[in-house]
Each structure stands twice: as structure tokens, then as C-alpha cells.
Interface confidence: medium
């Protein structure tokens, strides 16, 4: 037989299929010009010493073969003895290691079999009603195709699926979308309506992320509040490595997971902007406020579930940075100004109450006064900090209040609201004899003592009702007892106690009269 012809003789090897897993597959035959034809196939397994034979059976029942040697592609003309206008059945037999391996058969009319391309170029992937939609431009001059897909996950083998017939300039396919694992897809096409036409090669892999992006495994740490009233948020991040199918490993566009950081500033609720989203790589500086921090993972299908952490407020207090003056018209606070044109947020809440009860006020942008101070005033009618109780005050500052990451803490301190001088007056003052010339004076702690740093000192006043002489004794704010000595027996005294703050003198308690009994010796 001539090499250019199909040889109508028995092939030069025994006729027996070994049934092994390796062997020839994916046989495709098509017309490549007006009178030339090509068949190509894949061979799976060791290729050394393998000889391939393209077998062909005509409709009459006569069969022939082409010897292809070690090649997996063979061309022939319409004069090679194979009928091109009628249906023929073709398959490949590979002779290797004293055994024959056969490919599946294809039955087709060669003249009408056109070489179809797989989807070429950009395959667009989108989500549609919980399924995956793939779309691509139909290859030139190839409108009208059947399309199949195959897909696999990192832990499952290829599964075949059908996209149905296509008859347009763009083709599309609906495929299953996995919730939590990445998938690799490949597509192939063949001529529509042509009896037994060959499938194209499989397309390049299309890598598709899971519908739900993986949650990042992250930990946050927050540095101490600096002199500038800001603290660095740092991230210990181990983003979940998405397991990828074999064809998607390495560079797999489409499966990328991006992480965003969403900050929610819980303090100062009266500010304009409470949340801001940042690139995870841009770790921000925060004020000393309380925050919720969420890490949002997202892929091409959009954001996934949040993972949220709470960053508590920095409770370090500045005992003297805030001056408060109480006048007849109201109250004014003074503190060292940060810079020109700063907006301040003054936040207060009763001590011991839920953080959700914080109240705040936003100032208009203000410059420092001549003494370098910033101020905030409120009238008694406003009701701000009007109750006679302890308040925790925090002042935040920003040159750009709409940019969440630009707030800083100016100070945190405690303040006793309402008429503090009267409310702080010590009660239950009692006098007990201590010795022949001294007494012990005790009193119940002032309400001001519930407010850290507010009570500066107690002052105990003793008045000699005979001589009208008065002595005053300062007492540490942590003490509620003092010994008055150098007293004279039989003389009437009155004692009073007051509680002073740094900015306010307290109101004296009710006078308590006492005298030391004259000791009569026997």
C-alpha cells in the first residue's frame, strides 16, 4: 500500500483491544481545504515505541488503515480511498508493548466536517441566579455550535456538562457554581447539526472562585495611644489560602481574594461619618475611641461574610488637661488646642452606664484662643451634663471630620455635673473624743469621690466659738477622717467639712457643735 492511501488490507498487528486505561483518545477529523482532510488525536501513556494506525470503515463495510507511525496527526486527500461524501467510521489503534489500544469511534461525513475552535480569548464569568454564566465571542465563521463544558474542583475529577446549541455571534453557558471551593472549567465546541462532527480541543482553563470568598484568619493589635492622641492598628494576617484545582495553580486570574478593612468608630456618634473602608494593606492610625473593625473578603462575585472585632476605647485619663468654669450663664470647658481650624467632638456619658448612652456635641472648626486653648460652652438649659453625677468626658479632634481615620483623642477625663459644689458637700459629719485635747472628725465620702481625679481635697474648718478663731485643715481626697488637736476643754467649737475640685470650691457642710468635757480630778 502507498503511504498516501488508505490500505485495504489487514493491519500489521493482531486484532485485540487490551482494554488498558492508557491509549488513544479525543479523535478529531475534519476538512482543512477543498480536497484535504486531517485527523488528530491524543495519546495517554508512555509514548516510547508506540505506533498509531488510523482505521476507517466505509458504509459498504470495507475497512482500511493509514499508518501514522509515532505521529498523532495525519493528513490525506479525497483521493486516498476514503469516501468523503458518505458517512464513515474512524478510530485509532495504537500498537505498543505487544498490545493494541483502541480509541472511541467517530462516525461522520468528512466533507461536511469543519474544524471547530474552542472558545478563544476572553471568557467572561458572572453570577446569575446562583449559577455561573460564561460568555464568549463566537470564533470567526463558526456560528452554530454545540458546546460542552467540563469542570473539576481540587478534590474531584472532571465532570462533563452540556451548554446546549448556540447560534449567535456570542455564545454562553450556564454552569454549576460551588459555594465554598474553587473550580476549573474548560469548554469545547463542535459544528451544530453535522452528523458526528468532531469536538474541538478543550479551551484554556477558566478558573472560578467559590461563591463565598474564604474568611481571613486575622488578629489585630493596637498600640498605646501616642502623644498625638492616635494609636496604630496593626494586623497579624494569615489570609486563607484558597485551594485551587490543578489547572489553576500558579497564576489563576479570577480566583483572587481581596481583603478590605472596614472601620466603624463607635464613639462620638454625632460626627458625620462613622465608617470607612480601607485597603487591608493601609493599616490606619486610630483615635482612642472604641471601634468595630471588620475584615471583608471578596472575589469577583462580590463581598463575602464579615469577620468583626471590637477595639475598646483607650481609658487612660488626663487629670488636669481640662479646665471647667461654671458661671451663671452656663459652663465652659477649656483645653489645649490641637491646631488651627480643628473640629472637636466632646462626648460624655454617666459613669457606670452602658456605652450606648453617650451624648456628644460637635464644634464648628475653631482656632486656638490667645492662650492656645480651645473651648466649648453650654447653657444650663441645654441639660448637658446637668445631672449631679459623675461623667466620663472624651474630647476628639479632627481637621477633616468626614475622614474617619483622621480623628485623634485630645483628652479623656472625669467631670461631676450639675451643681457640683453643693452636691459634693460631705454628709454625716461626726465628732468623737480622741484625747484630752483632741477629737476625731469623720464624714461620709463626698459624691465627688466617685469621679476619679475630680475631688482635689477635703477642707475641715474648726471655729472656736469663744475667741472666734478659725483653723482650716486640708485632707487628702482618699481620707474621710482627721484629728483636730490643741483644743481646750470646756470651750464650744463648730466643725464643718467641704469638698473642693481643681476648679471649684465646695459648699461647707452643716456646722457640727462639740466641746471637750472638763476633766475633774478626784
Amino acid at each position: 500500500c502507498r503511504t498516501s492511501e488508505c490500505c485495504f488490507q489487514d493491519p500489521p498487528y493482531p486484532d485485540a483491544d487490551s482494554g488498558s486505561a492508557s491509549g488513544p483518545r479525543d479523535l478529531r477529523c475534519y476538512r482543512i481545504s477543498s480536497d484535504r482532510y486531517e485527523c488528530s488525536w491524543q495519546y495517554e501513556g508512555p509514548t516510547a515505541g508506540v505506533s498509531h494506525f488510523l482505521r476507517c470503515c466505509l458504509s459498504s463495510g470495507r475497512c482500511c488503515y493509514f499508518a501514522a507511525g509515532s505521529a498523532t496527526r495525519l493528513q490525506f486527500s479525497d483521493q486516498a480511498g476514503v469516501s468523503v461524501l458518505y458517512t464513515v467510521t474512524l478510530w485509532v489503534e495504537s500498537w505498543a508493548r505487544n498490545q493494541t489500544e483502541k480509541s472511541p469511534e467517530v462516525t461522520l461525513q468528512l466533507y461536511n466536517s469543519v474544524k471547530y475552535e474552542p472558545p478563544l480569548g476572553d471568557i467572561k464569568v458572572s453570577k446569575l441566579a446562583g449559577q455561573l454564566r460564561m460568555e464568549w465571542e463566537t470564533p470567526d465563521n463558526q456560528v452554530g455550535a454545540e458546546v460542552q463544558f467540563r469542570h473539576r474542583t481540587p478534590s474531584s475529577p472532571w465532570k462533563l456538562g452540556d451548554c446546549g446549541p448556540q447560534d449567535d455571534d456570542t455564545e454562553s453557558c450556564l454552569c454549576p457554581l460551588e459555594m465554598n471551593v474553587a473550580q476549573e472549567f474548560q469548554l469545547r465546541r463542535r459544528q451544530l447539526g453535522s452528523q458526528g462532527s468532531s469536538w474541538s480541543k478543550w479551551s484554556s482553563p477558566v478558573c472560578v472562585p467559590p461563591e463565598n470568598p474564604p474568611q481571613p484568619q486575622v488578629r489585630f493589635s493596637v498600640e498605646q495611644l501616642g502623644q498625638d492622641g492616635r494609636r496604630r492598628l496593626t494586623l497579624k494576617e494569615q489570609p486563607t489560602q484558597l485551594e485551587l484545582p490543578e489547572g489553576c495553580q500558579g497564576l489563576a486570574p479570577g480566583t483572587e481574594v481581596t481583603y478590605r478593612l472596614q472601620l466603624h468608630m463607635l464613639s462620638c456618634p454625632c460626627k458625620a461619618k462613622a465608617t470607612r473602608t480601607l485597603h487591608l494593606g493601609k493599616m490606619p492610625y486610630l483615635s482612642g475611641a472604641a471601634y468595630n473593625v471588620a475584615v471583608i473578603s471578596s472575589n469577583q462575585f462580590g463581598p463575602g461574610l464579615n469577620q468583626t472585632w471590637h477595639i475598646p476605647a483607650d481609658t487612660h485619663t488626663e487629670p488636669v488637661a481640662l479646665n471647667i468654669s461654671v458661671g451663671t450663664n452656663g459652663t465652659t470647658m477649656y483645653w489645649p488646642a490641637r491646631a488651627q481650624s480643628m473640629t472637636y467632638c466632646i462626648e460624655w456619658q454617666p459613669v457606670g452606664q452602658d456605652g450606648g448612652l453617650a451624648t456628644c456635641s460637635l464644634t464648628a472648626p475653631q482656632d486656638p484662643d490667645p492662650a492656645g486653648m480651645a473651648t466649648y460652652s453650654w447653657s444650663r438649659e441645654s441639660g448637658a451634663m446637668g445631672q449631679e453625677k459623675c461623667y466620663y468626658i472624651t474630647i476628639f479632634a479632627s481637621a477633616h471630620p468626614e475622614k474617619l481615620t483622621l480623628w485623634s483623642t485630645v483628652l479623656s477625663t472625669y467631670h461631676f455635673g450639675g451643681n457640683a459644689s453643693a452636691a459634693g458637700t460631705p454628709h454625716h459629719v461626726s465628732v468623737k473624743n480622741h484625747s484630752l485635747d483632741s477629737v476625731s472628725v469623720d464624714w461620709a465620702p463626698s459624691l465627688l469621690s466617685t469621679c476619679p481625679g475630680v475631688l482635689k481635697e477635703y477642707v475641715v474648718r474648726c471655729r472656736d466659738e469663744d475667741s472666734k478663731q478659725v483653723s482650716e485643715h486640708p485632707v487628702q481626697p482618699t481620707e474621710t477622717q482627721v484629728t483636730l488637736s490643741g483644743l481646750r476643754a470646756g470651750v464650744a467649737y463648730t466643725v464643718q467639712v467641704r469638698a473642693d475640685t481643681a476648679w471649684l470650691r465646695g459648699v461647707w457642710s452643716q456646722p457640727q457643735r462639740f466641746s471637750i468635757e472638763v476633766q475633774v480630778s478626784d
Epitope: 478590605r260 470607612r276 473602608t277 485597603h279 471583608i296 462575585f301 462580590g302 468626614e402 475622614k403
Partner: antibody
Framework: QVQLVESGGGVVQPGRSLRLSCAAS????????MSWVRQAPGKGLEWVAG????????EYADSVKGRFTISRDNSKNTLYLQMNSLRAEDTAVYYC??????????????WGRGTLVTVSS | AIQMTQSPSSLSASVGDRVTITCRAS??????LAWYQQKPGKAPKLLIY???SLQSGVPSRFSGSGSGTDFTLTISSLQPEDFATYYC?????????FGQGTKVEIK
């Protein structure tokens, strides 16, 4: 591929209103912040307004605050700019631009071709 | 609002030249700066974001640097398709603002 197509421009008298639309395709619209940027004839670029991915946050340039409203319909993949009380100085090509993030705090990675708004009596 | 000042306003250069455009912010903007290229009758195109990150698909002859208030766009070897107007833009604070533009013309 990503496509942004503006429409709704035209000639309008001062004081009147106009609504611009921007149809987005080729990407997951609900995952991106969007903005409007304008360019007066022969002049530079001016950012007009921006909106976050969900529509919850909006921002405006001082020159349009109180007159223009940016909004989005995520079900229609469409961005809008409602322009009221138009002035001659609002005459410009208006571009729709995508932010490469959920919010609008970054540059703009995709732009439409623009639609011309002429405010003239 | 933050003022963005570009210099020069225009420049003439030849193919193969190294071109540098600067942008100065009226206050610190960290690295929240983008550079765009615009050709007549076309929409702007993002070249650089975060002051120095090259946008995907942009040739590596474009580079950006700077932080705070002073920023630079460099074209290492000018190509015929690079003749255009270039804008910087800050996105540190609202309202976002652009520079007035630098026109790069053929010498």
C-alpha cells in the same frame, strides 16, 4: 470588558433640571464605588460627586452641594446624577467613573466616554 | 479644599526623552494620589494609584513617586502614543481635587 455608557446630556436653560444616567456592564456593579467627574470645554477635570457600593455614603463637591444628587440602582446596574438649578458654569462633559473599591476613596480605574451638558439661555 | 498644583503646565519633548511632571498638594495627603493620561476627545485613563502603584496594563515606562505633599510622574522613554495631557488627583480628603494638567507636546 468593563463598559460605562453615559446618557441624558443635552442643552438646557439655566435654572432647569437634567438627569444623567450611566449604564454599567462587564463587572459586578454592586461591588464598586462610583463617581461623576466633569470637564468644562478646554479646561481640566473636576470631581463632582461620589457614591459607595451600597449607596449608603454620598459625597459632593462644594460647587454642586445642595443642587446635585448622586444615586444608584444596583438592580439595573445604573448610576444617576440628578442636576437641579443648573448654571452656565455647569456646562461640561460629564464622565461616569468607577472606583477600584467599595467606597470612593481611591482613584478611578474605568471611565465612560462622557455626555455633554450645555447650560445656555 | 486641597489645592493640587502641577508643573510645568506644558512641555515639549522628543520620542525617547525622559519626562518628569511634578504635583504638589497644599497639605499632606499621605500617598493618596493618582495620575491620569487624557488624549483629546477621550476619557482619562488611570496610570498610577497610591502615588507609586502601576495600574494593570500600563507600560512600565510610567512610574510614580512621592508621599506627603510632593509627587512625581516619570516617563522613562517617551513614546509617540504618550503625547497627551496628564493630571494628578488627590483622594485623601473630600472633595477630591485634580491638578490643572500638564500638556506633553512633540518638540
Amino acid at each position: 470588558q468593563v463598559q460605562l455608557v453615559e446618557s441624558g446630556g443635552g442643552v438646557v436653560q439655566p435654572g432647569r433640571s437634567l438627569r444623567l444616567s450611566c449604564a454599567a456592564s462587564g463587572f459586578t456593579f454592586t461591588s464598586y464605588g462610583m463617581s461623576w467627574v466633569r470637564q468644562a470645554p478646554g479646561k481640566g477635570l473636576e470631581w463632582v460627586a461620589g457614591i459607595s457600593y451600597s449607596g449608603s455614603d454620598t459625597e459632593y463637591a462644594d460647587s454642586v452641594k445642595g443642587r446635585f444628587t448622586i444615586s444608584r440602582d444596583n438592580s439595573k446596574n445604573t448610576l444617576y446624577l440628578q442636576m437641579n438649578s443648573l448654571r452656565a458654569e455647569d456646562t461640561a462633559v460629564y464622565y461616569c467613573a468607577r472606583s477600584p473599591d467599595y467606597i470612593i476613596d481611591y482613584g478611578f480605574d474605568y471611565w465612560g466616554r462622557g455626555t455633554l451638558v450645555t447650560v445656555s439661555s | 479644599a486641597i489645592q493640587m498644583t502641577q508643573s510645568p503646565s506644558s512641555l515639549s519633548a522628543s520620542v525617547g526623552d525622559r519626562v518628569t511632571i511634578t504635583c504638589r498638594a497644599s497639605q499632606g495627603i499621605s500617598s493618596d494620589l493618582a495620575w491620569y493620561q487624557q488624549k483629546p476627545g477621550k476619557a482619562p485613563k488611570l496610570l498610577i494609584y497610591d502615588a507609586s502603584s502601576l495600574q494593570s496594563g500600563v507600560p512600565s515606562r510610567f512610574s510614580g513617586s512621592g508621599s506627603g505633599t510632593d509627587f512625581t510622574l516619570t516617563i522613562s522613554s517617551l513614546q509617540p502614543e504618550d503625547f497627551a495631557t496628564y493630571y494628578c488627583q488627590q483622594y485623601w480628603i473630600y472633595p477630591f481635587t485634580f491638578g490643572q494638567g500638564t500638556k506633553v507636546e512633540i518638540k
